[in-house]
């Protein structure tokens, strides 16, 4: 019993005066608390308490469940305790099977003994299985067995408290350890799509997947720069131990233009946080935007190939595409395909392949595309560059020599005189008249140029060259002069192709 100095309040005294008392099941428990300021007896087992205001605690027929700590307290708050074991061979353990452990912390298996004189108080695995090699524990007959530093691998470990009684091993009821993992990494978050494009009134639904070691992970959808609470629905799964998945689905049943913006799926645990965003764009109606990939004015040489290429954004998806030339629709020679196979792709490519173009095939080539909301078109003006062709070369009645040439770009006509039999004509002759004539063909066709010189200027035998040229090439025509006396006897025109 405690001893104190006179004058100071002293703790109560208990009879019998020992710290531990062992009684047999069915026997009487009689505990007397002596103190002038007696207040109460308190009985505690498995952390549950009962009180008694009588100074003598009497249990006539003791049961195993009367095992526990009996504490007498006085008005000064001073107390004294005795621990009573009620030995019951049929009930060696008192148990509370709720058993939770936090990873890396200790946890108590609550299986206090009713008989302190049994031996080898320890833990055993269920069904004869060994305990994990690294599992350490400390037994305390009055409280239970403390597992030290719980590991994640112990989750759902089945175990018994065990003692040896009269040479035989006796097991308690089963305990199943539920381990709460410590968060050692941030949650993993992903989103079903990084961007969404919708028309007003359509439903917006996006799913965020959150993965972590337990359901204690926190997650929410937030709208950036807004505090508005968003409506979410959850589905969750445990894919085995410490592999938890949650799907948080955000839905706006009828999206409006002002719902456009960035939505963030945010998740955190005690280790840290992670987030992922998705962008919503809501348009009042669909659209098509066309982007030419080459200049819309195209110059191509006669006989060469050209590809007319457009990219276009279409939402909703395009329904009709066509290429048109001279009011005729191409049935082949073109292809149309999405820019990417991504589910949210709205960009497409269309290519018209024009091969071995003739001079007569210049003109306006138009790409038309439509969806359920809008139509759009883009035109390419194609000019075919052709080498000049001399259409006519004549001596007119008024003595003029005239040369008419066609080509694209517009040909230039130069005149040269070659005296005698010389093959090279170098002396240039200035034309009297140059005109660009309107072509009767389609626009984008060849341009026609007419040039005239006065033949009376020539006094000697020789050849006059009419040379028509442009960026593509040149062509010449020749007039041969022969004088008899003072008269020009003949003028023989002929052409010479000069590549």
């Amino acid at each position: 019993q405690p001893s104190v100095s006179p004058g100071e309040p002293s703790p109560p005294s208990i009879h019998p005066g020992k710290s531990d008392l062992i009684v047999r099941v069915g026997d009487e428990i009689r505990l007397l608390c002596t103190d002038p300021g007696f207040v109460k007896w308190t009985f505690e087992i498995l952390d549950e308490t009962n009180e008694n205001k009588q100074n003598e605690w009497i249990t006539e027929k003791a049961e195993a469940t009367n095992t526990g700590k009996y504490t007498c307290t006085n008005k000064h708050g001073l107390s004294n305790s005795i621990y009573v074991f009620v030995r019951d061979p049929a009930k060696l353990f008192l148990v509370d099977r709720s058993l939770y452990g936090k990873e890396d912390n200790d946890t108590l298996v609550r299986c206090p003994l009713t008989d302190p004189e049994v031996t080898n108080y320890s833990l055993k695995g269920c069904q004869g299985k060994p305990l994990p090699k690294d599992l350490r524990f400390i037994p305390d007959p009055k409280a239970g067995i403390m597992i030290k530093s719980v590991k994640r691998a112990y989750h759902r470990l089945c175990l018994h408290c065990s003692v040896d009684q009269e040479g035989k091993s006796v097991l308690s009821e089963k305990f199943i350890l539920k381990v709460r993992p410590a968060f050692k990494a941030v949650p993993v978050v992903s989103v079903s799509k990084a961007s969404y494009l919708l028309r007003e009134g359509e439903e917006f639904t996006v799913t965020c997947t959150i993965k972590d070691v337990s359901s204690s992970v926190y997650s929410t959808w937030k709208r950036e720069n807004s505090q508005t609470k968003l409506q979410e629905k959850y589905n969750s799964w445990h894919h085995g131990d410490f592999n938890y998945e949650r799907q948080a689905t955000l839905t706006i049943s009828s999206a409006r233009v002002n719902d456009s913006g960035v939505f963030m799926c945010y998740a955190n645990n005690t280790f840290g946080s992670a987030n992922v965003t998705t962008t919503l764009e809501v348009v009042d109606k669909g659209f098509i935007n066309i982007f030419p990939m080459i200049n819309t004015t195209v110059f191509v040489n006669d006989g060469e190939n050209v590809d007319l290429i457009v990219e276009y954004e279409a939402f909703p998806k395009p329904e009709h595409q066509q290429w048109i030339y001279m009011n005729r629709t191409f049935t082949d020679k073109w292809e149309d395909y999405p820019k990417s196979e991504n589910e949210s792709n709205i960009r497409y490519v269309s290519e018209l392949h024009l091969t071995r173009l003739k001079g007569t095939e210049g003109g306006t080539y138009t790409f038309l595309v439509s969806n359920s909301d809008v139509n759009a078109a883009i035109a390419f003006n194609v000019y075919v560059n052709t080498k000049p062709e001399i259409l006519t070369y004549d001596r007119l009645v008024n003595g003029m020599l005239q040369c008419v040439a066609a080509g694209f770009p517009e040909p230039t006509i130069d005149w040269y005189f070659c005296p005698g039999t010389e093959q090279r004509c170098s002396a240039s002759v200035l034309p009297v008249d140059v005109q660009t004539l309107n072509s009767s063909g389609p626009p984008f066709g060849k341009l026609v140029v007419q040039s005239s010189i006065d033949s009376s200027a020539f006094k000697h035998n020789g050849t006059v060259e009419c040379k028509a040229y442009n960026d593509v090439g040149k062509t010449s025509a020749y007039f041969n002069f022969a004088f008899k006396g003072n008269n020009k006897e003949q003028i023989h025109p002929h052409t010479l192709f000069t590549p």
Partner: antibody, heavy 117, light 111 residues
Amino acid sequence: QVQLVQSGAEVKKPGASVKVSCKASGYTFTSYNMHWVRQAPGQGLEWMGVIYSGNGDTSYNQKFKGRVTMTTDTSTSTAYMELRSLTSDDTAVYYCARERDTRFGNWGQGTLVTVSA
Amino acid sequence: EIVLTQSPSSLSASVGDRVTITCRASESVDIYGYSFMHWYQQKPGKAPKLLIYLASNLESGVPSRFSGSGSGTDFTLTISSLQPEDFATYYCQQNKEEPYTFGQGTKLEIK
């Protein structure tokens, strides 16, 4: 014997918060997990979350995440459940329940929280 | 989460009748032979009261006319002979894994 005594009924406006208390006696408060369960009028029981014994770790039903906080005051053996951003859907009776030997063996008497404009 | 489905949602019976309520879980609630399934009784305006724990164990102080059985996903609460005080709503609950869940309830009414 074990008793859980909860705070009285509350009337709150939408958007407000409520903090319900649950005073425990008859056992070592820090040795047992305390759960919170609610029941909307005419509806079934819904688990809100738990505050674990010992270190005060919590685990919440995702439905209430971000709005609920469970705490304890060990000096008074009292558990608290605070619910924020209340809406009319939060009108319910809120119960605390002590987990013992794997089950909810003891319940508080319940606290009616009415959310009304 | 584990979804618990009770049937029937309501039933009418008379004093003395034998009544069975079932609870089906969307996945097994067993771990090492323990079924983490419990049954509660609730009367209007009162807190739930534990009747059966770990599928088949009668809580102390609960009359022996109440019994529980089942394992894995299928569980049954049986009242062998209905008494007037048994007319109430009954809930099953699992605590194998979080979030812990309850069945939607079975309302037992006097016929």
